[in-house]
Interface confidence: low
Amino acid sequence: LRPSRVHNSEENTMRALTLKDILNGTFSYKTFFPNWISGQEYLHQSADNNIVLYNIETGQSYTILSNRTMKSVNASNYGLSPDRQFVYLESDYSKLWRYSYTATYYIYDLSNGEFVRGNELPRPIQYLCWSPVGSKLAYVYQNNIYLKQRPGDPPFQITFNGRENKIFNGIPDWVYEEEMLPTKYALWWSPNGKFLAYAEFNDKDIPVIAYSYYGDEQYPRTINIPYPKAGAKNPVVRIFIIDTTYPAYVGPQEVPVPAMIASSDYYFSWLTWVTDERVCLQWLKRVQNVSVLSICDFREDWQTWDCPKTQEHIEESRTGWAGGFFVSRPVFSYDAISYYKIFSDKDGYKHIHYIKDTVENAIQITSGKWEAINIFRVTQDSLFYSSNEFEEYPGRRNIYRISIGSYPPSKKCVTCHLRKERCQYYTASFSDYAKYYALVCYGPGIPISTLHDGRTDQEIKILEENKELENALKNIQLPKEEIKKLEVDEITLWYKMILPPQFDRSKKYPLLIQVYGGPCSQSVRSVFAVNWISYLASKEGMVIALVDGRGTAFQGDKLLYAVYRKLGVYEVEDQITAVRKFIEMGFIDEKRIAIWGWSYGGYVSSLALASGTGLFKCGIAVAPVSSWEYYASVYTERFMGLPTKDDNLEHYKNSTVMARAEYFRNVDYLLIHGTADDNVHFQNSAQIAKALVNAQVDFQAMWYSDQNHGLSGLSTNHLYTHMTHFLKQCFSLSD
């Protein structure tokens, strides 16, 4: 369901989008992800904040936790224990980095309707979770891990060496959180809660990034984060497992690192429990083209974990880095030794493989010039996954079921024809044993969430259809959207073009390129959005284009790995090539072309403006990377190698924005950054500004005091208002 674009006799009642609409979030949509608690039950927070349990099979629902109880501790989140005796309530949420936050936790006893008193949890807690069975609690407080057998029991302290910014237990440090796991936690319960595995990160030798946080004090305080930039000392990681039934008996046991990994700097990339006594760990060399998957077994006699070499599986890339953005995770089958995993096939497309003994003998499950993207669930007889196979549009996502119980396996697209015009980009959420599942469609029409039978795929009910949004959009002149491709020199460049409502091919329009372009990203997706660029097309009459060039994902390794060890070259070239093709289409005013991007997109937009082509009149970089030597080791080295003479220092030096300062002379450049950006440090923009000043090049700049990489809150309004004025001035559009 795409809101009507037809211009009829009611056209005079239709209005264009305003910037206010965007900043107020007037046209935001809702999704519905059930919080599954069994094969046929889920929890959901109602509009009035009651926590309601739904039973799909009986059709009954009842409130398990009232909004009054939630409000009594100002709870913003909750978690039901698997035995359904307790609920944790989360309040005093305090954001840290992308995923991490601290909070206060209260435990509510459902059996007596009271909060658990005595042995209350300390505060603030960095992470807390129930065991998968019963109601044991594991939590992290001041970088140490604690265990409770029952919520009212005194805690058992598992680790003692935790120290702020030095040793992290059960939670990741900055770089593991952002670039490797990427989660706020680094501890994992075994399936029945017998064991608890956790990571310890030692950051003692990591250089610290320090920046001022101004607040409103007389003296700004300094934020210090151990943050390894490219080539710097990295965290040292160790994995431990403790028996949670008798935690004091032998204490935490370290899991050995595979010898071929331990011989030089390495990363831990993920942990997957297979059974209560079998665990799978994934490791990665610092030079991220070799990954090792290691399956380890518990030795009852020695109370240790044994990882035989025969259970090590190596994944190696000869053309780029291992995996896509991350190395994929295994999904184990019921025999508890074989597994399904996505990796590149011999033709260079990411596909599902079945590994029974060795990777060399893997059986390829999917194949074609498209990519398998995620394995959602493996049951006794079915495997559910998503891919972009359907109709050969890489920016779509459909859900498929492969029957693995029969031979040959048969494949069925579950979503391809459900709501074909409205829905071409899906994700899914499965209940236990895939008895039921929810489909969440993100577009291109108005998002809709539905509930389905896991055996027949039949739709049971609509969970959320965004009716209010649909009604609100009825009198809005939304822009038109097209997704098409350009074939240039054996490269396919997919693009999305957003066109003004009364678009006329015979007229000339200003063009704005919105770019991200980072390795393994995708901007051209069949999803619904009413955002800033929708407003620019609807109200200001601009054409906006997004282009997926070399380095982007889900179209095969040739396109993806083209940027390996050479960031900042082909991504920029492909944006420029696309602009030239758009000019040839005849409706672009070639004197009014701009480019803008955020983060990696700010880097690409800066390099495009400084490309010397004369194509761009103006452009904006928000929170750009300016030199790869300033960015995080895990991310940067994955794509660039090391900044050393005997590796890739030369391209690190050649690919900076500063090296092109002179070329900004003939463009209007707006540079924007938050001063408290923990991710892409303000240093990046400070160095661009310094280089431009030294080259005596005029430019515009805006900083956002105490704002991070997201520039949220009131800064968002200021940012988009400021950028709008800049673009309108550049394109000579009246205010």
Epitope: V73, S91, S94, T104, G215, E217
Partner: nanobody, 123 residues
């Protein structure tokens, strides 16, 4: 900006009690987390108790069960009820305020401070 003024300190015998008060200027008192720190001669300033804007309290292990922190948003005041005082509780007690979560034990995270009030516990 918020200005803080403590009162209620004094000399007391061991096992005695004192009620410390801290009055804050400004209309947005209710949005601040409030804390009581103390500093004994030659020692680091340490967080004793803190209370979030929502009323959740935190206590240092050394004072749990003896001290109680509370706030009265209508009076712009935060209180520290100190019972069963010990000689080692002798220190200058400071009131502090910050926006956001209350459970930050490092003084650097608390931008607003009072002048302090002396508490002396004699044996």
């Amino acid at each position: 900006q918020v200005q803080l003024q403590e009162s209620g300190g004094g000399l007391v015998e061991a096992e005695g009690s004192l009620r410390l008060s801290c009055i804050a200027s400004g209309r947005t008192f209710g949005t601040y987390a409030m804390g009581w720190f103390r500093q004994a001669p030659g020692k680091e300033r340490e967080l004793v108790a803190a209370i979030s804007s929502g009323g959740s309290a935190y206590y240092a292990d050394s004072v749990k069960g003896r001290f109680t922190i509370s706030r009265d948003n209508a009076r712009n005041t935060v209180y520290l009820q100190t019972n069963s005082l010990k000689p080692e509780d002798t220190a200058v007690y400071y009131c502090a305020a910050r926006r956001g979560s209350a459970y930050y034990t490092n003084r650097i995270d608390w931008p607003y401070w009072g002048q302090g009030t002396q508490v002396t516990v004699s044996s």
